[in-house]
Amino acid sequence: SCNTATCVTHRLAGLLSRSGGVVKDNFVPTNVGSEAF
């Protein structure tokens, strides 16, 4: 799985979209590592 910053950002965007944005406030690209996925 791709762990670059850009991959992490796009994966998180997809996760936020699927969850309707209902996630923790600190669940942002610079706070989460690839292990979050």
Epitope: C2, T6, A13, L16, V28, P29, T30, N31
Partner: antibody, heavy 119, light 107 residues
Framework: EVQLVQSGAEVKKPGASVKVSCKAS????????MNWVRQAPGQRLEWIGD????????NYNQKFKGRATLTVDKSASTAYMELSSLRSEDTAVYYC????????????WGQGTTVTVSS | DIQMTQSPSSLSASVGDRVTITCKAS??????VAWFQQKPGKSPKALIY???YRYSGVPSRFSGSGSGTDFTLTISSLQPEDFATYYC?????????FGGGTKVEIK
């Protein structure tokens, strides 16, 4: 409105250093990585590196390792790219860019800063 | 470093034409490819991410496809504002790398 506003054009002599700034607004600066990319005249885009403004972690293109330094000033929502030991081949337009999710999912780029290295 | 080879380097087309630009990676990059449009004297503008997803506001005539090593950007019906240079980028591995660009000119 998300904006990345870069500092103005610079003219430097070979061997000198240049520091380009990128002021971010319209989003939470520390939430998203900042990339730096350059483009020499008539050439392809070239990635310099990225920085995590939250923990100041960096990734560099090995081509620039040791010459490029990426930093941030969180309080000013500003990212910096310093390039040392300048040579004529470093003449290029330097861009900052960041993929933002909130408020709008998009890859935003600064307007570019022209750096000219000439004796 | 992963090399991104774009073809053609330039092409001439007319308004309304279907235009296809290809990008080949020197190794597998999954679908971690973006496409950008750049006009003279301007910053690059992002069009596509993850090989096939359009950013919001990008016209539907732009589409991307591919995975692994072979990628395509298609403009289904070229418009006057589409004459520009297009770049692919892989972000699967550091350092991120860009293709050499494809200049789309008016025939």
């Amino acid at each position: 409105e998300v904006q990345l506003v870069q500092s103005g054009a610079e003219v430097k002599k070979p061997g000198a250093s240049v520091k380009v700034s990128c002021k971010a607004s319209g989003y939470t600066f520390t939430d998203y990585y900042m990339n730096w990319v350059r483009q020499a005249p008539g050439q392809r885009l070239e990635w310099i590196g990225d920085i995590n403004p939250n923990n100041v972690g960096t990734n560099y293109n090995q081509k620039f390792k040791g010459r490029a330094t990426l930093t941030v000033d969180k309080s000013a929502s500003t990212a910096y790219m310093e390039l040392s030991s300048l040579r004529s081949e470093d003449t290029a337009v330097y861009y900052c860019a960041s993929i933002i999710i909130v408020p709008n999912y998009f890859d935003y780029w600064g307007q570019g800063t022209t750096v000219t290295v000439s004796s | 470093d992963i090399q991104m080879t774009q073809s053609p380097s330039s092409l001439s087309a007319s308004v309304g034409d279907r235009v296809t630009i290809t990008c080949k990676a020197s190794q597998n990059v999954d679908t971690n490819v973006a496409w950008f449009q750049q006009k003279p004297g301007k910053s690059p503008k992002a069009l596509i991410y993850s090989a096939s997803y359009r950013y919001s506001g990008v016209p539907s005539r732009f589409s991307g496809s591919g995975s692994g090593t072979d990628f395509t950007l298609t403009i289904s019906s070229l418009q006057p504002e589409d004459f520009a240079t297009y770049y692919c980028q892989q972000y699967n591995n550091y350092p991120y790398t860009f293709g050499g660009g494809t200049k789309v000119e008016i025939k």
